[in-house]
């Protein structure tokens, strides 16, 4: 049965940021600020009606 | 650098995998100026069944 939703896995590097342990902890300011910026950015990119949102954001060292 | 991994959701049939990647790549310059994020090494793939539950008959 089709859900009517398509999911895409997306991965990219942010080369001007340094990874540190605070990006492993969702309660830190660094984690939350980066997550907010990325979420906002994707809402800007995929402005068209079909975009439903993003989930499962993970950060790891590059 | 920081590697970001995430899952994007779209209404079925509204975008193909090529445009997901193309639209993201075309935004990289603005991402740098607006969010101070220098983005590279973009990779996009569809999330395979069963997660996306897209095995339905046409």
């Amino acid at each position: 049965l089709s859900t009517g939703v398509s999911f895409f896995f997306l991965s990219f590097h942010i080369s001007n940021l340094q990874f540190n342990s605070s990006l492993e902890d969702p309660s830190t300011d660094y984690y939350q600020e980066l997550q907010r910026d990325i979420s906002e950015m994707f809402l800007q990119i995929y402005k068209q009606g079909g975009f439903l949102g993003l989930s499962n954001i993970k950060f790891r060292p590059g | 650098s920081v590697v970001v991994q995430l899952t994007l959701a779209f209404r079925e049939g509204t975008i193909n995998v090529h445009d997901v990647e193309t639209q993201f790549n075309q935004y990289k310059t603005e991402a740098a100026s607006r969010y101070n994020l220098t983005i590279s090494d973009v990779s996009v793939s569809d999330v395979p069944f069963p997660f996306s539950a897209q095995s339905g008959a046409g």
């Epitope: 009606g49 | 049939g13 090529h18 395979p48």
Partner: antibody, heavy 120, light 107 residues
Framework: QVQLVQSGAEVKKPGASVKVSCKAS????????MHWIKQAPGQGLEWIGY????????HYNQKFKDRATLTADKSASTAYMELYSLRSEDTAVYYC?????????????WGQGTLVTVSS | DIQMTQSPSSLSASVGDRVTITCRAS??????LVWYQQKPGKSPKLLVY???TLTDGVPSRFSGSGSGTQYSLTISSLQPEDVATYYC?????????FGSGTKLEIK
Amino acid sequence: QVQLVQSGAEVKKPGASVKVSCKASGYTFTTYTMHWIKQAPGQGLEWIGYINPGSDYTHYNQKFKDRATLTADKSASTAYMELYSLRSEDTAVYYCARQGNYAAYYFDYWGQGTLVTVSS
Amino acid sequence: DIQMTQSPSSLSASVGDRVTITCRASGNIHNFLVWYQQKPGKSPKLLVYNAKTLTDGVPSRFSGSGSGTQYSLTISSLQPEDVATYYCQNFWNVPFTFGSGTKLEIK
């Protein structure tokens, strides 16, 4: 009504270049992507690449990347495909085709085709 | 690259017959499958998109179906004007490959 009118047939020698035009009318040229397709005599269809005339963004089939250039003149509502270093296997009908607008993944209008013959 | 395997390469059928052409993709193309009809000396014409949506003005005897990697185009009752070559196309990812075509003739 939407129309894509292509330039006339061309005969070229091996090693030469050819530039095929596709004049669009009946819609806003900059809001639809224009694709180019090759059809060799008696053969099937082969996708060459596309241009987004609004942003000038192009994407090519790797097979054609080194020998084809897609451009667009917004003021003339015309898309162009230039093919370089022609060889006999480039003899084909070349079509421009408009991709439908948002979430429209198909070619809804095609040009009439331009026959390019490469012969010494 | 996604390869599109179309079969049969040619087909001869009688007026009124039910005809089915199939197209197999080498990977899941998520219903981003298009069918075109090309008559001799003419440009291709859009028939079906999103695997099963009939474009405006196309007779209802045409229908598309399938999902994942397997797709088909069916003509429920073949008419003389349906003589043409039919192509499927992957519109999921670049390069936007076409099937090799099915030449349909009337017996």
